[in-house]
Interface confidence: low
Amino acid sequence: MEDEKPKVNPKLYMCVCEGLSCGNEDHCEGQQCFSSLSINDGFHVYQKGCFQVYEQGKMTCKTPPSPGQAVECCQGDWCNRNITAQLPTKGKSFPGTQNFHLE
């Protein structure tokens, strides 16, 4: 056997998946999980899912929240289950990168 047991890929996490991109699935697997909130035509659109390529997630997760979109990322099985992304309050200062949750 090529890899040490148990046969688990340590870079892959199970994530909660919610939103149109999930189809009928309620979970996905990727190298990072995320929870996002965006405003489309005045409606708040919440999504949860996973980035299957680390670089893709790294770019998105380091984007500062804006009045129209916020993304929170984490690494760990189901780590995005209880994360709800929040848009910044007007006038409130915030750091240039999102918190990175490790579970």
Epitope: M1, K5, K7, V8, N9, L12, M14, E29, Q52
Partner: antibody, heavy 115, light 107 residues
Framework: QVQLQQWGAGLLKPSETLSLTCAVY????????WNWIRQPPGKGLEWLGE???????NYNPSLTSRVTISVDTSKNQFSLKLTSVTAADTAIYYC?????????WGQGTLVTVSS | DIQMTQSPSSLSASVGDRVTITCQAS??????LNWYQQQPGKAPKLLIY???NLVPGVPSRFSGTGSGTHFSFTISSLQPEDIATYYC?????????FGGGTTVAIR
């Protein structure tokens, strides 16, 4: 979100070679162990073997001499070949993706071996 | 090979009953034990991984416990849609093996 779609011949004669292919959609092909599992009618589940994106394989020792699993990363597909089939190989064959468990499954293909 | 012995092979219970299935490994498999549900005519579905972790979307009436060689799977309140065959499976080493299955019916 990973979806597996499988196909292959459903009716074989004894001594022929079973051949099935499984296509992977919406998934990172390098992130999983790609497996084949079979289930004889009315019976339990038997693991046949696995392959990763690099082509490294592991087989069930009970079938090692007859089974071959291969991968085509350019098409995100993997295949099963089982030689010298007999009636005992009659089963539903599933392709499946394994990480901490077999989370994603193909629809299953009933393969019947009969003369 | 690691043998997985599942019991009972079949059971019948009433809606609302508590149902427990056991699985015994022939050697220590740590926590590398999963449970699947297979409804008639369908592929198996992963319910619980690593002994007790519920896959999201799976109802909380399903649970698992154990470690080492002895494991159990419980449906706290049996529902009509739970009619299925349940399998345990280890992934501590190769070959991966399954228990023989437990068929659950409504009395």
């Amino acid at each position: 979100q990973v979806q597996l779609q499988q196909w292959g011949a459903g009716l074989l004669k004894p001594s022929e070679t079973l051949s099935l292919t499984c296509a992977v959609y919406n998934g990172s092909f390098s992130s999983y162990y790609w497996n084949w599992i079979r289930q004889p009618p009315g019976k339990g589940l038997e693991w046949l073997g696995e392959i990763n994106h690099r082509g490294s394989t592991n087989y069930n020792p009970s079938l090692t001499s007859r089974v071959t699993i291969s991968v085509d990363t350019s098409k995100n597909q993997f295949s099963l070949k089982l030689t010298s089939v007999t009636a005992a190989d009659t089963a539903i064959y599933y392709c499946t993706a394994h990480t901490r468990g077999f989370l994603y499954w193909g629809q299953g293909t009933l393969v019947t071996v009969s003369s | 090979d690691i043998q997985m012995t599942q019991s009972p092979s079949s059971l019948s219970a009433s809606v609302g009953d508590r149902v427990t299935i056991t699985c015994q490994a022939s050697q220590d498999i740590n926590i590398y034990l999963n449970w699947y549900q297979q409804q008639p005519g369908k592929a198996p579905k992963l319910l619980i991984y690593d002994v007790s972790n519920l896959v999201p979307g799976v109802p909380s009436r399903f649970s698992g416990t154990g470690s080492g060689t002895h494991f159990s799977f419980t449906i706290s309140s049996l529902q009509p849609e739970d009619i299925a065959t349940y399998y345990c499976q280890h992934y501590d080493d190769l070959p991966l093996t399954f228990g023989g299955g437990t068929t659950v019916a409504i009395r």
